[in-house]
Interface confidence: low
């Protein structure tokens, strides 16, 4: 079928068209194109006679048409007139006609568009804004953008006049937007420039700023207004209702007391005529002065005395805060708080009460901190000690005791000698001594602030010979593969050589072994059932020897996994079955049995007359050691037969 | 449109008193202050105290500290000047006029206060 | 205070004619100046406000400027009913102060 194919459909003003035509019959005479959807010979465009080759131009023939062999016309320079059907007449060879209409659209290149308002400064609330695609064309469309974005759906939005018109009903501070609008046609799309919708609004409640309300005498008040407005808004202040200035900022340095009051700061925009005003009560307070601590008792003794630490001054409706040790006061039945904070008791106070203290005074800005109190407690003394430890020295070395006790004040010392008094200090030194300087060392030490004295007494024996030593340990009875021994040859004594025997032999090398404190200590570290053996220590210097008395070591262990005996598991019907159960343990265990899991005797052998096929199952043994805390156990299974069904059966006990 | 009326001339006997009244119309009497500004024989302007009506605040000239008392009645729209303890010097016209964040920008027709014995 | 100092503080001038009166601030007062006319007998009549605007229905002939301390007022073509007294005052401060005052006469 013979058909016309407009290439493009919408042609833009100016441009060209091609109506291009397929299945064109072969064997043709001629065709002809006409303006209009049918054969006119008034509106005749061309005529194409094929013989000929010639092309005849008709009545509507404009001089822009071109015809080509195949039947296509091309139309250049389109005009707006040109709109419409066409229609090609084909005549075939045979005479016989066909016809094939087309058509086309012509439509003007758009001119960018413009934006038109009635009202370029409306008033937030109040005004309405008709914004108007210029220019008015037809077959048009109209499109608005809002920042780029296609509108959004809103109430307050409208459209008319075929979408050229935009308004904005009751216009916002958010409608201060880029607004632009596009005509569309099919064959052009043009976008305006950006119309930037200016909303004259506010004032709104102005914000002063800084929010602070409370300030130091001495300070400088600067206070800042603002109010969202456009145009910005014209400032002033007020204070306690009297003008003082028109600007966004009030300045007053070096403020008073008697500069508390109302402060307003006015905003007015021009543009509106309206007003806001904000009001913020400013209140300026006399520095408060530095606190200090008092105290009821500037010496107390340690366990006896309370102190009561005061912050002064008082002030009415003021917080006091206690700091110890520069953290927050702990929680302590020793440490009580008045009901206004102000006084801190300490009760039956320590030594670890020292301190520091502070207190301080909180007001509406900040803390005032009271200088550091340090309490002088008075203790001790605690025991002296005396040192060195030794108390055997040999004769013709000088003895040299020195003693310690804890005290505040520092405690005064007196020694004496088998009760006699022998001087008031410190250290006691004695040159050269004799067997005749054995005898009871007192040290004794006094504190005459609290009126307490404490006395150690230390015997020290002056022999060329050595005392026979002892052994004493850190633990008497060790756990195996857990606990370590330590074993200390008594006493110590000056220029002195410490030995070891272990079952009468020198120390084997072990790396469980260890020697130390001028190897008056032996450790045995993670002692096993092993280490369970006579322990000797000798003492020896240039004029003697001596030997303890042995000392075994008493190693707790296990139980080990018990052991059931006889190993037999088969027995016969009517034998009697006597179980017995044995655990390397130290203490010797507890024994207990079940059979098939339920409990039976604490014993350790087990025996049961006369069994029969209703004793089959399983003999467990349980085994615990008190002493260790270990437990063990072993599971047996029994099996009974009828007499006589099986051979080798053991007959029992 | 503003406008501010004044009471009347007056005459007055030295160390009496005198009040002023100044009323408003055509506009929204609290939106701005009420200032008083004198003006004796020949001389020029002088600035006497203004009140703000909204909350009844005044401020006054050192000058006139003790003497001069500004009120206002914002159910009338009515602003007051009284000066007391007048001596002859106080003799001038007195306005009324209104400020609004820009200075005065509308003043009453002024009331001629004569002090004489 | 602040102090406001105008001069001239009269001035003889005839009709067309370009006249500038100056009033100076003993401190800076930014721009919060005006300036007012006063005919014997009339409450004074704002023309110029902030310095530099000029007043709904005040003619264009008037001019201000200046800021600081320094501010002037222009007539730039001098008409008969520009006779008058001319006070310039500050508002920087809510203690209000005028200046003396510019008598203005005709040659």
């Known amino acids: 079928k013979l058909t016309i194919e407009s290439t493009p459909f919408n042609v833009a003003e100016g441009k060209e068209v091609l109506l291009l035509v397929h299945n064109l019959p072969q064997h043709l005479f001629g065709y002809s194109w006409y303006k209009g959807e049918r054969v006119d010979g008034n509106r005749q465009i061309i005529g194409y006679v094929i013989g000929t080759q010639q092309a005849t131009p008709g009545p509507a023939y404009s001089g822009r048409e071109i015809i080509y062999p195949n039947a296509s016309l091309l139309i250049q320079n389109i005009i707006q007139n040109d709109t419409g059907f066409y229609t090609l007449h084909v005549i075939k060879s045979d005479l016989v006609n066909e016809e094939a209409t087309g058509q086309f659209r012509v439509y003007p290149e758009l001119p960018k568009p413009s934006i038109s308002s009635n009202n370029s400064k409306p008033v937030e609330d109040k005004d309405a804004v008709a914004f108007t695609c210029e220019p008015e064309t037809q077959d048009a469309t109209y499109l608005w953008w809002v920042n780029n974005q296609s509108l959004p759906v809103s109430p307050r939005l409208q459209l008319s006049n075929g979408n050229r018109t935009l308004t904005l009903f009751n216009v916002t501070r958010n409608d201060t937007a880029s607004y632009k609008c596009e005509t569309q046609n099919p064959v052009s799309a043009r976008r305006s420039d950006s119309v930037i919708l200016n909303v004259l609004y506010g004032p709104d409640a102005p914000t002063i700023s800084p929010l602070n309300t409370s300030y130091r005498s001495g300070e400088n008040l600067n206070l800042s207004c603002h109010a969202a407005s456009n145009p910005p808004a014209q400032y002033s202040w007020f204070v306690n209702g009297t003008f003082q200035q028109s600007t966004q900022e009030l300045f007053i340095p070096n403020i008073t007391v008697n500069n508390s009051g109302s402060y307003t700061c006015q905003a007015h925009n021009s543009d509106t005529g309206l007003n806001r005003t904000t009001v913020t009560t400013i209140t300026v307070y006399a520095e408060p002065p530095k606190p200090f601590i008092t105290s009821n008792n500037s010496n107390p003794v340690e366990d006896e005395d309370a102190v009561a630490l005061t912050c002064e001054p008082e002030i009415q409706n003021t917080t006091y805060l206690w700091w110890v040790n520069n953290q927050s006061l702990p929680v302590s039945p020793r440490l009580q708080l008045s009901n206004d904070n102000r006084t801190l008791t300490l009760l039956s106070v320590t030594r670890n009460d020292v301190g520091p203290y502070e207190c301080g005074i909180q007001n509406e800005l900040s803390v005032d901190h009271s200088d550091p109190v340090i309490l002088n407690v008075l203790y001790g003394p605690d025991d002296p000690t005396i040192s060195p430890s030794y108390t055997y020295y040999r004769p013709g070395v000088n003895l040299s005791l020195s003693c310690h006790a804890a005290s505040n004040p520092p405690a005064q010392y007196s020694w004496l000698i088998d009760g006699n008094i022998q001087q008031h200090t410190q250290e006691l030194f004695i040159s050269n001594i004799t067997e005749k300087n054995s005898g009871l060392y007192t040290c004794q030490a006094n504190n005459s602030a609290s009126g307490h004295s404490r006395t150690t007494v230390k015997t020290i024996t002056v022999s060329a010979e050595l005392p026979k030593p002892s052994i004493s340990s850190n633990n008497s009875k060790p756990v195996e593969d857990k606990d370590a021994v330590a074993f200390t040859c008594e006493p110590e004594a000056q220029n002195t050589t410490y030995l070891w025997w272990v079952n009468g032999q020198s120390l084997p090398v072990s790396p469980r072994l260890q020697l130390s404190n001028g190897n008056r200590t032996l450790t045995l570290f993670n002692v096993t059932r092993n280490d369970a053996r006579a322990y000797v220590c000798g003492i020896q210097n240039s004029v003697s020897a001596n030997r303890s008395d042995p000392v075994t070591l008493d190693v707790l262990y296990g139980p080990d996994t018990p052991i059931i005996s006889p190993p037999d598991s088969s027995y016969l019907s009517g034998a009697n079955l006597n179980l017995s159960c044995h655990s390397a343990s130290n203490p010797s265990p507890q024994y207990s049995w079940r059979i098939n899991g339920i409990p039976q005797q604490h014993t350790q052998v087990l025996f049961i007359a006369k069994i029969t096929p209703n004793n089959n199952g399983t003999y467990a043994c349980f085994v615990s050691n008190l002493a260790t805390g270990r437990n063990n156990s072993i599971v047996k299974s029994i099996t009974v037969s009828a007499s006589g069904t099986s051979p080798g059966l053991s007959a029992g006990a | 449109q503003v406008q501010l009326v004044q009471s009347g001339a007056e005459v007055k006997k030295p160390g009496s008193s005198v009040k002023v009244s100044c009323k408003a119309s055509?506009?929204?009497?609290?939106?701005?202050?009420i200032s008083w500004v004198r003006q004796a024989p020949g001389q020029g302007l002088e600035w006497m105290g203004h009140i703000i009506p909204i909350d009844g605040t005044a401020g006054y000239a050192q000058k006139f500290q003790g003497r001069v008392t500004i009120t206002a009645d914002e159910s009338t729209s009515t602003a007051y000047m009284e000066l007391s303890s007048l001596r002859s010097e106080d003799t001038a016209v007195y306005y009324c006029?209104?400020?609004?964040?820009?200075?005065?920008?509308?003043w009453g027709q002024g009331t001629l206060v004569t002090v004489s014995s | 205070d602040i102090q406001m100092t105008q001069s001239p503080s009269s001035l003889s001038a005839s009709v067309g004619d370009r006249v500038t009166i100056t009033c100076r601030a003993s401190?800076?007062?930014?721009?919060?100046l005006n300036w007012y006319q006063q005919k014997p007998g009339k409450a004074p009549k704002l023309l110029i406000y902030?310095?530099?605007s000029l007043q709904s229905g005040v003619p264009s002939r008037f001019s201000g400027s200046g800021s600081g301390t320094d501010f002037t007022l222009t007539i730039s073509s001098l008409q008969p009913e520009d006779f008058a007294t001319y006070y310039c005052?500050?508002?920087?401060?809510?203690?209000?102060?005028f200046g003396q005052g510019t008598k203005l006469e005709i040659k």
């Open positions: 055509g506009g929204t009497f609290h939106d701005g202050a």
């Open positions: 401190q800076s007062i930014s721009s919060y």
């Open positions: 005052q500050q508002w920087r401060s809510h203690l209000f102060t």
């Open positions: 006029a209104r400020y609004r964040f820009y200075g005065i920008d509308y």
């Open positions: 902030a310095a530099s």
